[in-house]
């Protein structure tokens, strides 16, 4: 049987059940390389409390559909008196990066995971030439996820004192220049994730090969190498390589630019101080507030919730968007869709789509940007579920009793962007991280 998601085959992936202190290793095309789980384990459970290993999915006992992968085992389990077998179930959804498998829940018999990934899309529009896993768990099983830094179009400029060259990078995947035919970036060779531009020439100095690594709790490393044979004439016989070290800052701060810290014979060392390198619980919340010892900040957007069936309305030229954030009130137009953001076509109000659901909510504060994300909306033709990204700005003089109002700024591949100026986005900082 052919592997259902070949892009995911090259790596052993990790997921964590934080509540029970369990680490899962997943290899969807072969077997994980863990002796204690046996030679054919596709999903291996490592219970860190009891220091035991169990195979909870056998690579030989795999069954697949376009959106579901199941690995059975021969191990019996007792579920309400019936004799079942232990199994793992991975539900796949279309995403814009390779993504990460997320542990959902486990019963006595079934271990459930969900994975939003380009590999599950109906169309190839989000697929990279080359992409590697962009997250890692530290020794305390805390997740560090750089997926939000991945640029689907364009690149980051590395801060470098050399006026004659420009070094462009992407994170964990190659640089796509198709949206900007006019700039210097256009000359970058396909597949490159680190592109050096000198004058009118552009050179591939690194492609992603291995996934993100953790070197210390707050330092993550990504390495790019030039795959192509044939040396560049300005590299003194060496093969180019790029090492990017992502550093979690010691306290809350605005984002910084990736900086070139060393360069020798086409070996480029870059340091990037960014809160995205911090563990995810420091940056994100599933509620509409971020506060407490762990986050170093106090943010509470819950006053923006609308009661009594009213919604915020944002004009999107062809569409009207109805928003009801930080609550579970149904939007009338999107009845029974559990939508936090509802898209209604002006010319035909029967055309209604959920652009993100209220139980699929993430509040993120990172590098000075406060963002509320709603995902899991109605599917687009690519298979990608519509989502909405609301970028908040602090405005102490916002109208509507300080609440302000969301403004639609545009849509990119079924992701809808809004900005929202409100006094409730004014962040209060604590200093003890």
């Amino acid at each position: 049987q052919a592997a259902p998601f070949p892009e995911l085959c090259s790596y052993t992936w990790e997921a964590v059940d934080t509540k029970n202190n369990v680490l899962y290793k997943i290899n969807i095309c072969g077997s994980v390389d863990i002796v204690q789980c046996g030679p054919s384990s596709a999903v291996c459970e490592h219970d860190l409390k009891t220091r035991t290993y169990h195979s909870v999915g056998d690579s030989v006992l795999r069954s697949a559909t376009r959106s579901l992968l199941e690995f059975n085992t021969t191990v019996s389990c007792d579920q309400q008196g019936t004799n079942h077998r232990v199994q793992s179930s991975i539900a796949f959804l279309c995403g814009k990066t390779l993504g990460t498998p997320e542990f959902v829940t486990a019963t006595e018999c079934v271990h459930y995971f969900e994975w939003r990934t380009t590999a599950a899309c109906k169309k190839d529009i989000f697929k990279a030439n080359k992409e590697v896993p962009c997250y890692v768990f530290d020794e305390e099983l805390r997740k560090h996820d750089l997926n939000p830094l991945i640029k689907l179009s364009g690149a980051y400029l590395v801060d470098d004192s050399d006026p004659d060259t420009s070094l462009f990078i992407n994170v964990c995947r190659d640089i796509d220049t198709l949206r900007d035919p006019g700039s210097q970036l256009r000359a970058c060779p396909p597949g490159t994730a680190a592109c050096l531009v000198r004058g009118h020439q552009a050179f591939d100095v690194g492609q992603p090969r291995d996934g993100l690594k953790v070197v210390r709790k707050d330092r993550l490393v990504l390495s790019y190498v030039r795959e192509e044979a044939g040396k560049l004439d300005f590299c003194d016989g060496h093969s180019p390589a790029v090492t990017i070290t992502f550093v979690c800052p010691s306290e809350r701060r605005e984002g910084t630019i990736p900086k070139l810290t060393a360069k020798s014979n086409c070996r480029y060392e870059i340091e990037w101080i960014t809160e995205y390198a911090c563990h995810r619980d420091y940056l994100e919340s599933k509620t509409c507030s971020l506060s407490g010892e762990q986050q170093d900040v106090s943010i509470d957007l819950t006053p923006l919730a609308q009661s009594g069936g009213s919604s915020y309305i944002s004009d999107g030229k062809e569409y009207l968007f109805y928003l009801n954030v930080c609550g579970e009130t149904e939007i009338q137009f999107c009845n029974k869709k559990q939508a936090a953001v509802c898209q209604v076509k002006k010319s035909d109000t029967s055309q209604v789509k959920a652009a993100g659901r209220y139980h699929n909510q993430t509040l993120r504060y990172s590098d000075g940007d406060l963002t509320l994300i709603y995902f899991g909306g109605d599917e687009c033709s690519s298979g990608f579920q519509r989502m909405s990204v609301i970028n908040f700005e602090c405005n102490k003089t916002a109208g509507n009793d300080g609440k302000g109002t969301p403004v639609f700024t545009g849509e990119v591949d079924c992701t809808y962007f809004f900005t929202w100026d409100t006094e409730y986005a004014c962040v209060h900082h604590h200093h003890h991280h």
Epitope: G154, R179, D180, D369
Partner: nanobody
Framework: QVQLQESGGGLVQAGGSLRLSCEAS????????WGWFRQAPGKEREFVAA????????SYADSVKGRFTISRDNAKNTIYLQMNSLKPEDTAVYYC????????????????WGQGTQVTVSS
């Protein structure tokens, strides 16, 4: 590719103010970072100000800090440059530009450009 059209230039006395606008059409507003540049006769095109697409983060050339403000109205797909306390040395053609490169102020990293609008500051 995005198309850009500047307006708002003109002749103004030293110490006066102008507000430049740049309307974007074509490709979606949301994937770009935006910049204002200027070019005086016989000089290189130079960076003035920039704003990131994903937030309202801004950066300015030292020569205009405290006097110029870049902003945007996402609903109108328009970028603005509010210029106060103008000086004769601010005389130039002002260009609006869009880039898919984050953290850049280099004109060669901007792939889409407007036609420019003339600003003349008399003493």
């Amino acid at each position: 590719q995005v198309q850009l059209q500047e307006s708002g230039g003109g002749l103004v006395q030293a110490g006066g103010s102008l507000r430049l606008s740049c309307e974007a059409s074509g490709r979606t507003f949301n994937t770009y970072n935006w910049g204002w540049f200027r070019q005086a006769p016989g000089k290189e095109r130079e960076f003035v100000a920039a704003i990131r697409w994903s937030s309202s983060k801004t950066s300015y050339a030292d020569s205009v800090k405290g006097r110029f403000t870049i902003s945007r109205d996402n609903a109108k797909n328009t970028i603005y440059l509010q210029m106060n306390s103008l000086k004769p040395e601010d005389t130039a053609v002002y260009y609006c530009a869009a880039s898919i490169v984050d953290f850049t102020t280099n004109p060669s990293h901007f792939g889409s450009w407007g036609q420019g609008t003339q600003v003349t500051v008399s003493s």
